[in-house]
Each structure stands twice: as C-alpha cells, then as structure tokens.
Amino acid sequence: SEVEYRAEVGQNAYLPCFYTPAAPGNLVPVCWGKGACPVFECGNVVLRTDERDVNYWTSRYWLNGDFRKGDVSLTIENVTLADSGIYCCRIQIPGIMNDEKFNLKLVIKPAKVTPAPTLQRDFTAAFPRMLTTRGHGPAETQTLGSLPDINLTQISTLANELRDSRLANDLRDSGATIRIG
C-alpha cells in the first residue's frame, strides 16, 4: 500500500521523495509520473531530472527542494480535484535492478470554508520521511512511512522547504510551540 498525502483545491501539494547522492553533485536520473510505477519506467512523466539538471517538466510541477542534494520531492501548484491519484517517484540508480520506486497517493479535498485544522492533526502528514527499500517490480514496490523522530532543527528546515503548505503557515502565524520528547 502507499501512503496518502492530502491537499485542498487551490493549494500546493507536496509529495516527498529523497535519495542520498553518492557524492555531492553525483546525481542520478529521477522521474515523476502520474500513475503507479510500471516495471521499468515512470508512467506518464510530469518531471524528469538527469545527472545534471531538471531536463523535463510540465506546467505546475516543480522541485522545490535542493535536488542536487537528493531532495526530489514534487510540488504540484494550485491543485484541482483532477490531480488526485497515484504518483510515481523513480530514482534510476545505475546498475542491475537498482531502481528505487515509490508510489504516493495524493488526495485532493474541496477547499474548506471552516477554520484550518490544528497543527496536531496535520503534523505527521506534512512531515513524512522516506523509508527507502528496494523492489524489483511493481508488486515489490515499497512506499513511505511517517516520521517518528523529528527534531526542532528538522522542523525549521522542513517548514522553510514547505513554505507554501498550510502547516508552514500555521507554524508562522500561530507561533505554536512543539515539544519533542
């Protein structure tokens, strides 16, 4: 099964995907596609990187993080209900069957007119971490788990990276204090 990520119509959606480059600047090709990861490729590609740069992207899809450090998380701008569905992040590590592939489910909810949800409720969903395990085919694809051990430095960093998300706005506007421990 895949982990579910949520956004509201009109917001930016964030789908996390990371890898650790063997050395700084030693990048591997990555592709993002709409639809579950097929056996070799990425489905209907919306964004692709090569060993140097983003070499293909479509409107509204971009990488907000530092992809040169392995943060290839996808941001989808101004989402609509039609953006709901499964997305594939495929890290095309050279070698024999080294690909890492992740299926992420994006659920788009109609825009709320009620107050924003509390920080407590959205915390885990907004700060996921990759559990990177390898699979050799779609049936063995592993996906993502929730974050068990965030610290304040990570919160600060992630909040900056997710500045368009509701949680980042909550952190900024509410002055919330988060206790770890």
Partner: antibody, heavy 119, light 111 residues
C-alpha cells in the same frame, strides 16, 4: 517511421563473446526503455535484457553475469554484450522498444539477428 | 518468476470462425487496477507484433476483430472472425515483474 535494425549476429564458439547492436530511428530514443528478446529455433519468446531511459539494467537469471545491455543516446543505439556463450543461447535476437511511460511491453520490434553458438 | 501457461498449444479453426485463446499466469498480474498482460502475434519469419496491452486495450492499427479480456490470473484473446492473415502464433506476456515472461504460444492453424 519507427525503425529498429539489429546487427552483429553470427557463428561463435561456446565460451565466446558477441556484441549485438540495435540502431533506432524515427523516435526520441532517450525517452524509451529498450529490451532484447530472443527466440530459439522453433521455440517461444524469451526476454533477455532491458535498459530503462535512465540507464537502469534488468536481466533474467538465465543470462545475469554473462550478458550486459547498454545504450548510447547520442547514437540512438542499444547494445547487447554477450559473454561466456552457450549452445542454449543460439537464437534470433530481437531488439524491441518498450512502450513509452511503461517499458514492460514492446510496441516496435526489429527483424532480428541470428546468433549461433556451436563448435 | 511468473509462469505464463497458454492453451491450447494448437487451435484449428476455419476461416470466418471465432477463435478463443487462453493464458493463465501463475500469480496475479493486477497492479493498481490494471492487468499487466499483453498479447502478440507472430507469423513465420517475422518479428512479433503487439496486438493487445493491459489485457483489453487494442493497439493502434490492429483490426477490431481482435479483443482481449480477463483479470487477475486468467486472460483471453478472442478473434471474432478469423481471416486468412490471422493464422499465426500468439503469445501472451506479463509486465508485472522482472523477469518479464511470455507464454509458450498458441498456434492458430487452418482447419
């Protein structure tokens, strides 16, 4: 028009090596996974190697460690290097294009090149 | 590995008749609601030709008399009214897992 043209087949002794080439034209080669599929005389089809658009490699156990696949996007070409050849590797070898966005099935095939492993 | 078993090995049919070919996978090839199963046609001395992908989608340029159905482990290729050019060998193939595997083929011959 999409075209795939294989070359490099021939007669080789057991234990020998051979390098097959597949020249592609009529499509944006770098966007597609490419595979090699073989067919022994009078037998069925067997997939033997694939390389994704990003350069990841895939093989069945029957050829792993003996065969390798590579691609040169600048030359629109795909290659199958076959080492430690055995009599059971005798077959027509087809180069096949994986369907865009998937790669796991084949919408265009070359006409094949015959590899005969015999002493 | 996923083993693909086709039946019958040979099918004798008269022109104009309906042909039904079967393929069974050793495990499910369903993936997020799609059956990762293909059918190919091969004539003597020629390369295979893709007919059906994802169990039931007819490849562009393939006559409408060809259709595919099935899900899970059991799949069928149907040729509604056999034409002379349809006598060939037909292979199923799964794209669920590496290694990609083909069935042993069904030869459709003239009765």
């Amino acid at each position: 028009e999409v075209q795939l043209v294989e070359s490099g087949g021939g007669l080789v002794q057991p234990g020998g090596s051979l390098r097959l080439s597949c020249a592609a034209s009529g499509f944006t080669f770098s966007r597609y996974a490419m595979s090699w599929v073989r067919q022994a005389p009078g037998k069925g089809l067997e997939w033997v190697a694939a390389i994704s658009s990003g350069g990841s490699l895939y093989f069945p156990d029957s050829v792993k460690g003996r065969f390798t696949i590579s691609r040169d996007n600048a030359k629109n070409s795909c290659y199958l290097q076959m080492n430690s050849l055995r009599a059971e590797d005798t077959a027509v070898y087809y180069c096949a294009r994986g369907r865009e966005a998937d790669g796991g099935y084949f919408d265009y095939w070359g006409q094949g090149t015959l590899v005969t492993v015999s002493s | 590995d996923i083993v693909m078993t086709q039946s019958p090995a040979t099918l004798s049919v008269s022109p104009g008749e309906r042909a039904t070919l079967s393929c069974r996978a050793s495990e499910s090839v369903e993936y997020y609601g799609t059956s990762l199963m293909q059918w190919y046609q091969q004539k003597p001395g020629q390369a295979p030709r893709l007919l059906i992908y994802a169990a039931s989608n007819v490849e562009s340029g393939v006559p409408a008399r060809f259709s595919g159905s099935g899900s899970g482990t059991d799949f069928t290729l149907t040729i509604s009214s056999l034409q002379s050019e349809d006598f060939a060998v037909y292979y199923c193939q799964q794209s669920m897992k590496v290694p990609l595997t083909f069935g042993g083929g069904t030869k459709v011959e003239i009765k």
